[in-house]
């Protein structure tokens, strides 16, 4: 059922990376517009993206209020130019999204190696602590602030002349690894949340190699 020429949204999908969270859906509207509502399981519905012809809605501002909550969204369809019109049951046509818990489900963004410094046969590799849109006391929190020790980084490192990748892990943003003196090494990092069963890993960071500008060398 529903208003003539109005179709319900479908394929509602959460797209979320480092808590930047967008709800996407289909179809592209023909003579209709959409409004999105979002709520926690126990909360009130809040409307966003009013009467839009887009098929996405940025819900980041809502979910960052409490990333450990579980959210539900719904997309209402209205005839273009007649947004007061309702379906046969006296309500606008709408479709519910899957539930979404940002803390458990947001994808981990590609990390970046901030710097590496060699001192003798040790190299300190530092991973950039990316800022998120999650706030506390009016300041934006970093990924480490939000996830704490739940977030680990895996470092892959290898001699420039070799293919075998050694690994190291840290629950901070720094690695201290042993290297052979006089050898150049390359590095790549991956963010991991081991307690998860889905969306556990980020993509790998860009590879950085010794002898390039990010590094420092000290005897």
């Amino acid at each position: 059922s529903g208003t003539t020429n109005t179709v319900a949204a479908y394929n509602l999908t959460w797209k979320s990376t480092n808590f930047k969270t967008i709800l996407e859906w289909e179809p592209k509207p023909v003579n209709q517009v959409y409004t999105v509502q979002i709520s926690t399981k126990s909360g009130d519905w809040k409307s966003k993206c009013f009467y839009t012809t887009d098929t996405e809605c940025d819900l980041t501002d809502e979910i960052v209020k409490d990333v450990k909550q579980t959210y539900l969204a719904r997309v209402f369809s209205y005839p273009a130019g007649n947004v007061e019109s309702t379906g046969s049951a006296g309500e606008p046509l709408y479709e519910n999204s899957p539930e979404f818990t940002p803390y458990l489900e947001t994808n981990l963004g590609q990390p970046t190696i901030q710097s590496f410094e060699q001192v003798g046969t040790k190299v300190n590799v530092t991973v950039e602590d990316e800022r998120t849109l999650v706030r506390r006391n009016n300041t934006f929190l970093s990924l480490r602030d939000v996830f704490g020790k739940d977030l680990i980084y895996t470092l892959y490192y290898w001699k420039s002349s070799s293919s075998g990748k050694k690994t190291a892990k840290t629950n901070t943003n720094e690695f201290l690894i042993d290297v052979d003196k006089g050898e150049n090494y390359c590095f790549s990092v991956q963010a991991v949340i081991p307690s998860r069963t889905v969306n556990r890993k980020s993509t790998d960071s860009p590879v950085e190699c010794m002898g390039q500008e990010k590094g420092e060398f000290r005897e």
Partner: antibody, heavy 120, light 107 residues
């Protein structure tokens, strides 16, 4: 339920080749690291190598480097150990094991093992 | 590579005995040490991770401790099902390495 099942073990002549499989169920291998570990008859555990199926990165023990290759097919949720130029000292039960990539990351889950015998 | 030197290689004990097995790492491995139990014809089973944390489902008579680069597995009161071979493993760096194993036999 997390399960790892190895297969492909056989009797093979020195210099021969063999491919072992490690079929995973109950989890997605690309989210984890898969290791191969072997145990010669009456001996201890020896680490062979690992693969991170998400990026294809590998590392091998010196004793097998250049002869063994680990690969993974994420569509089949299976890791492989290709063994070439086999020697008598490669005779062992071969296990695959899952590493959850946590900081503590021990080998939490192991397969039942598959026996490789290299003999003329 | 980091060497894990495990001792003793074998020991004989009776049910109810307190058993201690040690592993010494050739260099610092922080707490990245695990202990496994293996019975004949079976795959190893994880007992202890991060040097002292008991893995889920493992009886509390098993415990692990660390002192610098020395790691200890203790079985407070040996039970009949504990007769097996025990291995330590470091996973602080690649390659991960195992101790030589300790076979716990019935006296």
């Amino acid at each position: 339920e997390v399960q790892l099942v190895e297969s492909g073990g056989d009797l093979v002549r020195p210099g021969g080749s063999l491919r072992l499989s490690c079929a995973a169920s109950g989890f997605t291998i690309s989210y984890y690291i898969i290791h191969w570990v072997r145990q010669a008859p009456g001996k201890g555990l020896e680490w062979v190598g690992y693969i991170d199926p998400s990026n294809g990165y590998t590392y091998y023990a010196d004793s097998v480097k250049g002869r063994f290759t680990i690969s993974a097919d994420t569509s089949k949720n299976t890791a492989y150990l290709q063994m070439n130029s086999l020697r008598a000292e490669d005779t062992a039960v071969y296990y695959c094991a899952r590493d959850d990539q946590s900081v503590s990351s021990p080998f939490e889950y192991w397969g039942q093992g598959t026996l490789v015998t290299v003999s003329s | 590579d980091i060497q894990m030197t495990q001792s003793p290689s074998s020991l004989s004990a009776s049910v109810g005995d307190r058993v201690t097995i040690t592993c010494r790492a050739s260099q610092d491995v922080n707490t990245a040490v695990a202990w496994y139990q293996q019975k004949p014809g079976k795959a190893p089973k994880l007992l202890i991770y991060s040097a002292s944390f008991l893995y889920s489902g493992v009886p509390s008579r098993f415990s692990g401790s660390r002192s610098g680069t020395d790691f200890t597995l203790t079985i407070s009161s040996l039970q009949p099902e504990d007769f097996a071979t025990y291995y330590c493993q470091q996973h602080y760096t690649t390659p991960p390495t195992f101790g030589q194993g300790t076979k716990v036999e019935i006296k």
